[in-house]
Interface confidence: low
């Protein structure tokens, strides 16, 4: 048999939102289960669909799902059939409507003091509770003569007079929310005593000193009184102006003139009627001065030929709004065409170079007019007056390669060295038109060179080969002052280089031929075994064809080189004592002896009364102090070399003597003993 | 809900820099020309730099050479970086979102609530000593 484990039961439900009718059952065999709504089947849709064997409600419609729902499981094998208990929906919702006359038939029979009825067409369920408004304002039972029920949806206002003139509409609310009338009743109930509107002032603008005309009518039985008040109550009657205003004129009819205005005149103006009976009248219009403010300035642009482009006029700010459009060579320029006017942008479609020029946006209102100039250039690509050519450049003097080109605008140049970028620095300078200065050319600036020259249209580059011309130098320059060890083997080197190898040969400077010991070897001058006559000077001369000679003067000096005949030693002194550190040297010319002490130069003049350099070179410290205590460097030099020998120096505190020890017993280290 | 919040205001000396940012939301921020207003005290709202949605930059000519005003589209951010300030630069400084109908000294004018200007800031207050 078929079981129903779970059946759909009534419920409350809310207009377009979920619901679910719940349906579980239990059979031997497969039984396939449907929904009966008022006895029909249910078909599946977006919004009402099953889900298993329930049926769910995306969204409950208020007259598609009134009705008995019903679940329904067949066993199609056996034909055995069970159906669920009845189920409904208690469908809440509410509808706007509108505020319709009900009470008499129509408009044209509402009569002061007669009974009027309006109708709220707000329905919903559960049924709703009203309130009405009049002139957005809540009505109450009872108020100002009428009788409301604000459970019902009908007001009743009995008798209607004038007073009851207003835009009446309602709102309800129940279980389901709140609605509000879709469309309003505005109730007109005419008294010849209220004030009524014939002629309203309009907003104006006008320009400085020119004048402003307000009109304002009213009609009332007996005639209304008429006020006009400026921005902050000032009354203006024709008797009383406020300062501001001397030059307002108040007419018979209404109208309120204002002569020669200015800035301080602008703002709201109210005109007042007042009836013999009912509230004032109040109309507001406001008094705007026309002004229009500079317009910004255009950036110039340059543009391509064949491109489209667009060059938007910001309008300036204006009252009214100001006109504008664009000019060239003094004329309007058309609303379509190749280059036209569109909204506030000038369009140059498939711009040509005859387009150049100065283009005007102008802008106007009643207040004057604006123009702001824009200069169009139309680009070109550069072209060639002369291109960088192969050129061979002097080594040590400034080079030249030209790259002149001509375009609009200007064409910006640059040059590429070896495919890097030419930042200008001390030896690189591009002039103005393109030319590219080396200054002081040098061997490695043999290479190619391309120069670019480009504007917003497009580019043209050409390169150019360098061939550095050498001059002829010697490298390295030998050295004016050189020494020789005396009994020594010794050797001058001296080289050169030039457009061709250059020939290298060696002389004395006297003209006096070399001895047989000294050899000149392919500018290598060789002495085998260094004399005292092979001192003196002698000349390097470095020659080839095309660039003739050149000759380098060196002084040689023959010396006997340092040695050192005493070196300090390593010494140890008590504290308080005195320190020799012992240096002799010995060499041709005669070494001068200089100490160094702790990293610095010890200055013979400055030493002070504790330190002495002796003529011989040894150092002698007086009274030394522990800071005393470091390396100490002994340097002798002469004109021709230099050699430096180093010991430390220990300062120690004396030892108290012990008394095992004997008045012979020698000191753990070497001592200096004065 | 549409949001103009400027910062960076404070005091400064003359000669001296500041920096100011304005934040905007609720509103298509590329789609408009983005302004810089201020008004010192007792004085009408003057119009100071416009950035246009398409990057061009104009100036009054009170701050012409000494402020710049930059826009970040990406972060809808306008500002304004002002620089040699001077004492007569103390005002309450606005920017705004500017439709470009209207001008400022007539909103300043007949205008009795901010609801009557496009879209604008609360402002912020910038005080030069000398």
């Known amino acids: 048999a078929i079981v129903f484990i779970k059946q759909p039961s009534s419920q409350d439900a809310l207009q377009g939102r979920r619901a679910l009718l719940r349906c579980e059952v239990e059979a031997p065999g497969l039984v396939h289960v449907y929904w009966l709504l008022d006895g029909a089947p249910v078909q599946d849709t977006e919004r009402r669909f099953t889900q298993g064997s329930s049926l769910s409600f995306a969204a409950v419609d208020r007259l598609q799902d009134s009705g008995t729902f019903q679940c329904v499981a067949r066993d199609d094998v056996t034909g055995e059939e069970a159906r669920s208990a009845n189920a409904s929906f208690n469908i809440k919702w509410i509808e706007a409507g509108p505020v319709v006359l009900k009470h008499p038939a129509s408009e044209a029979e509402i009569q002061p003091q007669t009974q009027v009825t309006l109708r709220c067409h707000i329905d919903g369920h559960p049924r709703p509770t009203y309130q009405w408004f009049r002139d957005g304002t809540p009505l109450s039972d009872g108020q100002s003569n009428n009788t409301v029920s604000s459970k019902e949806r009908n007001l009743t206002l009995r008798p209607a007079g004038p007073e009851h003139s207003g835009l009446y509409s309602c709102c309800a609310h129940n279980a389901f929310g709140q609605a509000c009338s879709s469309q309003n009743f505005t109730l007109s109930i005419a008294d010849e005593s209220f004030a009524r509107v014939v002629l309203a002032p309009q907003d104006v603008i006008v320009a400085r000193n020119e004048e402003a005309m307000f009109h304002c009518q009213f009609s009332a039985q007996p005639p209304p009184n008429l006020q006009w008040l400026f921005e902050d109550e000032t009354p203006i009657t024709n008797r009383s102006r406020p300062p501001h205003l001397r030059r307002a004129t108040v007419f018979a009819n209404g109208s309120l003139l204002l002569t020669q205005v200015r800035p301080r005149n602008a703002g709201v103006y109210r005109c007042i009627g007042q009836g013999q009976r009912g509230p004032p009248v109040i109309l507001e219009a406001t008094l705007h001065l026309a002004e229009i403010e500079d317009m910004p300035l255009f950036e110039p642009r340059v543009f391509t030929a064949g491109s489209e482009e667009r060059v938007t006029c910001l309008p300036p700010k204006g009252l009214p709004e100001p006109s504008v459009w664009w000019e060239h060579a003094g004329v309007r320029l058309p609303t379509h065409g190749r280059v036209y006017q569109k909204g506030h942008e000038l369009v140059l479609a498939s711009i040509a170079e005859s387009d150049a020029g100065v283009y005007t946006c102008h802008a106007a209102n009643l207040a004057g007019q604006r123009r702001q100039d824009v200069n169009i250039t139309v680009a070109t690509v550069p072209t060639w007056l002369k291109k960088p050519q192969d050129s061979q450049l002097e080594e040590g003097k400034p080079g030249y390669l030209h790259c002149l080109t001509q375009a609009t605008p200007k064409p910006t140049v640059v040059w590429y060295r070896n495919q890097m970028l030419i930042s200008e620095d001390s030896r690189f300078e591009v002039f103005k038109n393109g030319t590219l200065r080396i200054n002081n050319v040098e061997v490695y600036d043999g290479t190619w060179y391309r120069c670019v020259s480009s504007t917003p249209a497009g580019s043209i580059e050409a390169q150019a080969r360098v061939q550095v011309l050498e001059k002829l130098k010697f490298t390295p320059p030998p050295q004016p002052q050189q020494c020789m060890e005396f009994d020594k083997e010794a050797t001058v080197p001296c080289s050169a280089t030039g457009r061709e190898k250059p020939t290298i040969k060696w002389e004395r400077a006297d003209g006096s031929s070399l001895p047989e010991w000294v050899t000149d070897n392919a500018g290598t001058l060789h002495f085998a075994r260094v004399t005292r006559d092979d001192a003196g000077n002698y000349t390097c001369i470095a020659s080839n064809g095309p660039q003739g000679q050149i000759r380098a003067h060196v002084q040689l000096t023959v010396a006997v080189f340092i040695t050192f005949k005493v070196e300090p030693e390593r010494t140890t002194v008590y504290q308080g004592h005195t320190a020799l550190l012992q240096c002799e040297a010995q060499g041709d010319p005669k070494p001068l002896i200089q100490w160094k002490g702790k990293d610095r130069i010890l200055d013979p003049t400055k030493l002070g009364p504790r330190m002495h350099i002796f003529q011989n070179g040894s150092l002698v410290i007086h009274d030394v102090a522990p800071e005393d205590s470091g390396r100490y460097t002994c340097i002798a030099g002469n004109s021709c070399n230099i050699k430096h020998t180093e010991a430390p120096l220990y300062v120690v505190d004396k030892p108290v003597p012990e008394e095992s020890e004997g008045p012979g017993s020698p000191p753990p280290y070497k001592m200096i003993q004065t | 809900q549409v949001q103009l919040q400027e910062s960076g205001g404070g005091s400064v000396q003359a000669g001296g820099s500041l920096r100011l940012s304005c934040t905007a939301s609720g509103f298509t921020f590329d789609d408009y020309d983005m302004v810089w207003y201020r008004q010192a005290p007792g004085n009408e709202y003057e119009w100071l730099s416009t950035?246009?949605?398409?990057?061009?930059?104009y100036y009054a000519d009170s701050v012409k050479g000494r402020f710049t005003i930059s826009r970040d589209n990406a972060k809808n951010t306008v500002y304004l970086n002002m620089s040699r300030v001077k004492p007569e630069d103390t005002a309450v400084y606005y920017c705004?979102?500017?439709?470009?109908?209207?001008?400022?000294?007539?909103?300043?004018?007949?205008?009795?609530?901010?609801?009557?200007?496009?879209?604008w800031g609360q402002g912020t207050q910038v005080t030069v000593s000398s």
């Open positions: 950035v246009s949605r398409g990057g061009n930059l």
């Open positions: 705004a979102a500017d439709l470009r109908s209207v001008p400022s000294t007539y909103r300043a004018r007949t205008c009795r609530g901010r609801y009557c200007r496009d879209y």
